[in-house]
């Protein structure tokens, strides 16, 4: 099993662009979960999709934050406008 | 029926603290963020702070930074405001409202917070 | 920070009017939100993501824009509809709110 891929490895981008980020999770998984971890404020659960479905997005107030999981094998986190503070690593996340 | 109830207003001396409270029911507090509003006398409203779900993600109004505290207890469904060193200009009615629709969903009626020696 | 005008501040009107209130950002937001608050209550929401209509809300009120610039329409005002009027935005924290509208009875 390849785990859970997530593309791109890095992103480099203008302030005020849109980033989009994917993620496919593993195979059977039910649960999709968006991470951010920065140094400043650690990690932060962004959103988390049950069976496709959104059902915590509180980690993510700003509406310049997007996220979609169009069917069980993908997932988008999408940033329009981005910002300096955007800067991070984020993670996705797949559970049973 | 969603409600939210604050408490803990009161008067307090120039540099004083208090801890405002938000009890929560009629909807599942662990699955939505919060937020905190204030009004001044008078005055329109200024946004305090937000707290998500499970505490990971935590904002504050620029000004605030450093003196406010949120924070939640989703096993007692209530919501926390800790004010530190408080001010004059601190004096406001101060509301917690639940996030819903992108947006302030709900709000409770408000408790009021009076800073004056 | 993003700073909300609104305009005008104050508003005269009688009922069956059609009003409009604009809310103008320093920087382009992605949505408006809309409240209406009356003396000594809580603020109401009235409008999420720029349009949609909150539960419970008179299809009366719409609201409209994109980028720096928004607006909040009463097609026909009534009585209960004098209340003071906030825009908030959320797209970048923190979360500001325009000054306030204040719409009275002429």
């Known amino acids: 099993d390849a785990g859970v891929i997530q593309s791109p490895r890095h992103e480099v981008t203008e302030m005020g662009q849109e980033v989009t980020l994917r993620c496919k999770p593993i195979s059977g998984h039910n649960s999709l979960f968006w991470y951010r971890q920065t140094m400043m404020r650690g990690l932060e659960l962004l959103i988390y999709f049950n069976n496709n479905v959104p059902i915590d997005d509180s980690g993510m107030p700003e509406d310049r934050f997007s996220a979609k999981m169009p069917n069980a094998s993908f997932s988008t986190l999408k940033i329009q406008p981005s910002e300096p503070r955007d800067s991070a690593v984020y993670f996705c996340a797949s559970s049973l | 029926e969603v409600q939210l109830v604050e408490s803990g207003g009161g008067l307090v001396q120039p540099g004083g603290s208090l801890r405002l409270s938000c009890a929560a029911s009629?909807?599942?507090?662990?699955?939505?963020?919060m937020h905190w509003v204030r009004q001044a006398p008078g005055k329109g409203l200024e946004w305090v702070s937000y707290?998500?779900?499970?505490?990971?993600?935590?904002y504050y109004a620029d000004t605030l930074k450093g003196r406010f505290t949120i924070s939640r207890d989703n096993s007692k469904n209530t919501l926390y405001l800790q004010m530190n060193s408080l001010r004059a200009e601190d004096t406001a009615v101060y509301y917690c409202?639940?996030?819903?629709?992108?947006?302030?969903?709900?709000w409770g009626q408000g408790t009021t917070v009076t800073v004056s020696s | 920070d993003n700073q909300l005008t609104q305009s005008p501040s104050f508003l005269s009107a009688s009922v069956g009017d059609r009003v409009t209130i604009t809310c103008r950002a320093s920087?382009?937001?992605?949505?408006i939100y809309w409240y209406q608050q009356k003396p000594g209550k809580a603020p109401k929401l009235l409008i999420y993501?720029?349009?949609n209509l909150a539960p419970g809300v008179p299809s009366r009120f719409s609201g409209s824009g994109s980028g720096n610039e928004y607006t909040l329409t009463i097609s026909s005002l009534q009585p209960e509809d004098f209340a003071t009027y906030y825009c908030?935005?959320?797209?970048?924290?923190?979360?500001?709110f325009g000054q306030g509208t204040k719409l009275e009875i002429k």
């Open positions: 409202a639940r996030r819903g629709n992108g947006a302030m969903d709900y």
């Open positions: 009629g909807f599942t507090f662990s699955n939505f963020g």
């Open positions: 707290i998500s779900s499970g505490s990971s993600t935590i």
């Open positions: 920087s382009s937001v992605n949505y």
């Open positions: 993501y720029t349009s």
């Open positions: 908030q935005q959320f797209t970048s924290s923190p979360f500001t």
